[in-house]
């Protein structure tokens, strides 16, 4: 028994930002599970992984390192990517591993999402620079 | 006026626990991500743990995962950490520091520090 | 993750002087590098975020320049206040990571 996953086919992200979310055929609720995303179409890098184990609060962490958090909806997990390159744009997938309660369940494989990212415009810099921020 | 004020530190065996508390004022607690940067006695800046602004994800330094725990009471305006299984090395001052939610790891505001000493 | 290396460790100069103190990282963090100043005793506070922007409250005379692998923060004349420890840190990739720092000593 797979857990099916579905992913927006393309996703454009402006301003090296972007939020992918990957839903489940699956409630997670009370589950302990490990959602990751993979980058590419053998997913050989993993991007960002979401552990979650009953509590209310999602570990986060990525070994690769892509500056990522995620956020738990009860059949779903979003990533939220920033500070990417125009040269990672490629296709990425969302996987699932529920380790509790028994069975240990794993997901088909999706058709992944294309992140586009795009450059950022290079502005002439203004005559005066806005506001200082703390 | 923003401000930051850690408490909770002291000295502790190895292998014990502590937990610190950062109580903040002056701003909108709620609306920002919130951090722990160590400083290990006359040494560098450590970044150690973070949490989203409502507490609902967290991230840890690999060296201190698993026996640190990030947490915070938007209620109280209140973030904490709690420290177990604590070794030598975990010897520093512990900063909490506030990140715009948007930038995520840029550190505008940092307390005065709580200084946590694991010694026999 | 990313090492960020300081250069010099420790810079003597006497107030008035111009110091110029390097970060250097390991692979491109765009623009997202920080500086802090942290005196004995003290907190580390924010001077100039996203490589060349200032902090509210910083004097002009904090500059910072630089993307990529190479950054430069720059005090164009010492005042006396200046004298302490200058951190660079990234937030480009996680986990965030920081320089050794470079120390700000009277000459």
């Known amino acids: 028994n797979k857990i099916l996953v579905k992913q927006s086919p393309m996703l454009v992200a402006y301003d090296n930002a972007v939020n992918l979310s990957c839903k489940y055929s699956y409630n997670l609720f009370s589950r302990e599970f490990r959602a990751s995303l993979h980058k590419g179409l053998d997913s050989a890098v993993e991007v960002c992984v979401v552990y979650g184990n009953y509590s209310q609060q999602l570990q986060v962490y990525s070994k690769t390192g892509f500056n990522c958090d995620g956020k738990l909806g009860n059949e779903s997990v979003t990533f939220y990517l920033q500070n990417l390159y125009v040269n990672q744009t490629d296709i990425y997938f969302c996987k699932i591993e529920v380790m509790y309660p028994p069975p240990y369940l794993d997901n088909e494989k999706s058709n992944g999402t294309i992140i586009h990212v795009k450059g950022k415009h290079l502005c002439p810099s203004p005559l005066f620079p806005g506001p200082s921020k703390p | 006026e923003v401000q930051l004020v850690e408490s909770g530190g002291g000295l502790v065996q190895p292998g014990g626990s502590l937990r610190l508390s950062c109580a903040a004022s002056g701003f909108t607690f709620s609306s920002y991500w919130m951090h722990w940067v160590r400083q290990a006695p006359g040494k560098g800046l450590m970044w150690v743990s973070r949490?989203?602004?409502?507490?609902?994800?967290?991230s840890h330094a690999e060296s201190v995962r698993g026996r640190f725990t990030i947490s915070r009471d938007n209620a109280k305006n209140t973030l904490y950490l709690q420290l177990n299984g604590l070794r030598a090395e975990d010897t520093a001052v512990y900063y909490c520091?506030?990140?715009?939610?948007?930038?995520?790891?840029?550190?505008?505001?940092w307390g005065q520090g709580a200084l946590v000493t694991v010694s026999s | 993750e990313i090492v960020l290396t300081q250069s010099p460790a420790t810079l003597s100069l006497s107030p008035g002087e111009r110091a110029t103190l390097s970060c250097r990282a390991s692979q491109s963090v765009s623009s997202y590098l920080a500086w802090y100043q942290q005196k004995p005793g003290q907190a580390p506070r924010l001077l100039i975020y996203d490589a060349s922007k200032r902090a509210t409250g910083i004097p002009a005379r904090f500059s910072g320049s630089g993307s990529g692998t190479d950054f430069t923060l720059t005090i164009s004349s010492l005042e006396p206040e200046d004298f302490a420890v200058y951190y660079c840190?990234?937030?480009?990739?996680?986990?965030?990571?920081f320089g050794q720092g470079t120390k700000v000593e009277i000459k």
């Open positions: 520091a506030r990140a715009d939610s948007s930038t995520w790891y840029e550190f505008d505001f």
């Open positions: 949490i989203n602004s409502d507490g609902s994800s967290a």
């Open positions: 840190q990234q937030r480009n990739n996680w986990p965030p990571t």
